[in-house]
Amino acid sequence: YDFTNCDFEKIKAAYLSTISKDLITYMSGTKSTEFNNTVSCSNRPHCLTEIQSLTFNPTAGCASLAKEMFAMKTKAALAIWCPGYSETQINATQAMKKRRKRKVTTNKCLEQVSQLQGLWRRFNRPLLKQQ
């Protein structure tokens, strides 16, 4: 999906209002310095591409993020403010349903959510030069 035509300011507002709080809740009890940010993004469409991938695509050691509260709200925000987004997700969701595992918060998931927090922070500061 090409995130170029999304309403970035509304997605940012939704993130600041509630999605960010849900990410913090998920990470509660984890030190903010525990994980190094290894995933980066260069502009807002790129950031949303990476956020979409880390939130909804199962990875080795972390198959369960798509059912978390922050993921549900992320999906809602992208569907509402990115034209045509919800239609592109049908095949991805069917595939994910087949692979879905029991919900377990592993260290790998905590690391992945830490990366997500970094991507969202970068999304919110689009004018910053890439590190």
Epitope: T18, D22, M69, M72, K75, A76, I80, S86, I90, Q94
Partner: antibody, heavy 122, light 108 residues
Amino acid sequence: QVQLQQSGAELVRPGSSVKISCKSSGYAFSSYWMNWVKQRPGQGLEWIGQIFPGDGDTTYNGNFKGKTTLTADKSSNTAYMQLSSLTSEDSAVYFCARSGFDYGYFYAMDYWGQGTSVTVSS
Amino acid sequence: EIVLTQSPTLMAASPGEKVTITCSVSSSISSSNLHWYQQKSETSPKPWIFGTSNLASGVPVRFSGSGSGTSYSLTISNMEAEDAATYYCQQWSSYPLTFGAGTKLELK
């Protein structure tokens, strides 16, 4: 304007099934999660689950797994909830409720259907 | 699951009286995830207060909400007849979504 129109009251036999509908208009149906909420007579509200019509993704309250099945038909902008193996405990009013970001970007159930009464009786 | 405990369950207030309804949450949640709904008999619930303190469209300014962590409240500064209803708090912090049992507010 956003409207959620639910199907009419149902009187059903114990052990049978019932499917109630919630027809949406005035917004992009595929892009918003749809919730279902149960209210027994004189009681409070109980969340059953939700469906994302765009891809059929669902999340259920564990108390209702096996009892309810949520589906959505994008061609008619309609969400459905099927209740199976009905008992007197299932007699209630069932509401559909869209969830979205309000003007302050808080996420909540912002529009509700008028409710469908289901009475289970022999 | 997160349990929301409302108090009182039932109360009556005279016109002009100040009313406070509380919602105690079993584990701490972000204030952005606590909402209030109003329901009058035989009708569907209406969104009333979003994110602890933000009034929904059309809600009179005599209503206010406050709180954080595990303790939240809805206040009516001057009770009016049209405020007689049942009020529910609800959390959107974790699954399953849960509601308080409701506070029925009657006109004295």
